[in-house]
């Protein structure tokens, strides 16, 4: 058993049929010594008396808010949560496996630049009685500070018969060094509590590996005289690190017909303009990627060809 | 060239070669995103590699003030990786494919380090840790880790030279 926060405790249980469970001793936070009784949740049934209560925690029915009273007055609470371990593996019932970029990916994180600011998100089908707490650091043995905000519900989607909820959190490294080569990864830890179930999820990454620039901005076409070619031009996204002579991007320009079955025309360039062949009903799209490190491409910025 | 007395390197040549190094480093080990090498407990291997750190003056302001600190750090790293790529980690079993970019990568690391340090001028270089994996699978894992680490190193070096070529070239 360990303390998650004040008056909230997590009991770690090996979860299998007829498991013996864990013996837990609760102590009433009071100077009083006599006349103390214990109850669980809203029940008035007295579970025991005395300053301490010893219980055998085996299942969710044994978890909940234990309260010690004296003469009708509440003295203190202890909330017990369960953390299940099945076949040596901690349960991951609360969050959905996003399976990208690999299986058992529950947390996904992205950064728009090298400033040390990043966003993480996760998915669940649970809509109520759900709380999240996020902590982060750079490195684990001698951790350096990363400050995370509160996790918020950022999107709701319907997936077949189910509703899916996306939560996200923004974090900022306290003393970021955008130009340095990272040697210690960022660690992100999410505590998830659903009713009386506790789970924790972690992710470890370098900012450079989660970089995904915003799409190029100000995408414009200039038709070339007496030609079916157009000059496409664009600018670096505002959110990208500066100066651009140091934090450079490379770009992919794509001409795509109205159908996915049409062949694409792609041009790769380090410049912020390119000349491509335009055709009726096609669209021109541009996306960006760090020029020197192959992290994610941005989403496309698009304009119609005509 | 970064010669004694602190005159400028051939920024544009360094830029071109460092960008080529980035391309080669990724073509030598493109599937890195699909292997979480940090899970493999790599403290004893990649903790020893020279990283370009915050105080090394490789940021735009540091380069403007005095690029020599940064160039020396880059040079150390280039020599370090050049020696690693020439070691039995890469020359031993399992053999690299004949068309593997590792050979080109090795040559380009040497080329860039020579651009930074002409003959007769010596910066101190970092000791290469004695990494002698006994099993071929250990060697393979070590190669992946070294290339992964090299990708990060050459990305910073390429940014330095791109910025230098754009703003510090005479």
């Amino acid at each position: 058993i360990w303390e998650l926060k004040k008056d909230v405790y997590v009991v770690e249980l090996d979860w299998y049929p007829d498991a013996p469970g864990e013996m837990v001793v609760l102590t009433c936070d009071t100077p009083e010594e006599d006349g103390i009784t214990w109850t669980l949740d809203q029940s008035s049934e007295v579970l025991g008396s005395g300053k301490t209560l010893t219980i055998q925690v085996k299942e969710f029915g044994d978890a909940g808010q234990y309260t010690c009273h004296k003469g009708g007055e509440v003295l203190s609470h202890s909330l017990l949560l369960l953390h299940k371990k099945e076949d040596g593996i901690w349960s991951t019932d609360i969050l959905k496996d996003q399976k990208e970029p690999k299986n058992k990916t529950f947390l996904r994180c992205e950064a728009k630049n090298y400033s040390g600011r990043f966003t993480c998100w996760w998915l669940t089908t649970i809509s109520t009685d759900l709380t999240f707490s996020v902590k982060s650091s750079r490195g684990s043995s001698d951790p350096q500070g990363v400050t995370c905000g509160a996790a918020t519900l950022s999107a709701e989607r319907v997936r077949g018969d189910n509703k899916e909820y996306e939560y996200s959190v923004e974090c900022q490294e306290d003393s970021a060094c955008p130009a340095a080569e990272e040697s210690l990864p960022i660690e992100v830890m999410v505590d998830a509590v659903h009713k009386l179930k506790y789970e924790n999820y972690t992710s470890s990454f370098f900012i450079r590996d989660i970089i995904k620039p915003d799409p190029p901005k100000n995408l414009q076409l200039k038709p070339l005289k007496n030609s079916r070619q157009v000059e496409v031009s664009w600018e670096y996204p505002d959110t990208w690190s500066t100066p651009h002579s140091y934090f450079s991007l490379t770009f992919c320009v794509q001409v795509q017909g109205k159908s996915k079955r049409e062949k694409k025309d792609r041009v790769f360039t380090d410049k912020t303009s390119a000349t491509v062949i335009c055709r009726k009903n096609a669209s021109i799209s541009v996306r960006a990627q760090d020029r020197y490190y192959s992290s994610s491409w941005s989403e496309w910025a698009s304009v119609p060809c005509s | 060239r970064a010669v004694p007395g602190g005159s400028s390197p051939a920024w544009t040549q360094c830029q071109q070669l460092s960008q080529k190094l980035c391309t080669l480093a990724w073509s030598a080990h493109p599937l890195v995103g699909h292997m979480d090498l940090r899970e493999e407990g790599d403290e004893e291997t990649t903790n020893d590699v020279p990283h370009i750190q915050c105080g090394d003056g490789c940021d735009p302001q540091g380069l403007r003030d005095n690029s020599q600190f940064c160039l020396q750090r880059i040079h150390q790293g280039l020599i370090f990786y050049e020696k690693l790529l020439g070691s039995d980690i890469f020359t031993g079993e399992p053999s690299l494919l004949p068309d593997s970019p590792v050979g080109q990568l090795h040559a380009s690391l040497l080329g860039l380090s020579q651009l930074l340090q002409p003959e007769g001028h010596h910066w101190e270089t970092q000791q290469i840790p004695s990494l002698s994996p006994s099993q071929p699978w250990q060697r393979l894992l070590l190669r992946f880790k070294i290339l992964r680490s090299l990708q990060a190193f050459v990305a910073v070096a390429a940014r330095v030279f791109a910025h230098g070529a754009a703003t510090l070239s005479p």
Epitope: Q229, V255, G257, E262, K263 | -
Partner: antibody
Amino acid sequence: QSLEESGGRLVTPGTPLTLTCTASGFSLSSYWMTWVRQAPGGGLEWIGTIATSSTYYASWAKGRFTISRTSTTVDLKMTSLTTEDTATYFCARGLTTDYDLDLWGPGTLVTVSS
Amino acid sequence: LVMTQTPASVSAAVGGTVTINCQASEDIESYLAWYQQKPGQRPKLLIYSASTLTSGVPSRFKGSGSGKQFTLTISGVQREDAATYYCLGADDTTTVFGGGTKVVVV
């Protein structure tokens, strides 16, 4: 407006050969350009296409045939030629992409023989 | 992608009708064109986007179909229509000619 292929000749097996397509009356760089071949007495066979810089090839042509362009020409570079590659090679202009070929050259004959 | 063209050859009287079929091995929407080639000449585009007639091509040539099944119909065949006709289909990675249909006008 017209297209003309050049470079076709008699070569021995294994010899590399480059064919060139030039345009009159319009700018090649404004169009997707395609190479097609036809063996003596045979049907038409699509080799590949070049857009602005993207290239597409028939599966049998990948690795052995390379299409490239300059502002005024489109080249077809062929390596490891065999007698099976004996054919008339046409270059053609795509109206939109590479299936609606509205302008064709007269073709150039490549003969591979030992 | 495979384009199967039938028949391999067909005879028609002047004024008659010829129908040539082309079947794609997968859905290519309307990315199909028809070409006419006479002996010793370069191919000529007749129809593109499955049914759009190229300018200058007589209206007796008609293209139809989409997806996997396509047809070229020549109504009121003329002597000058004697030639080999090819379909050409395209998807997002490749482009393939049909085997050709030789039209003999009797």
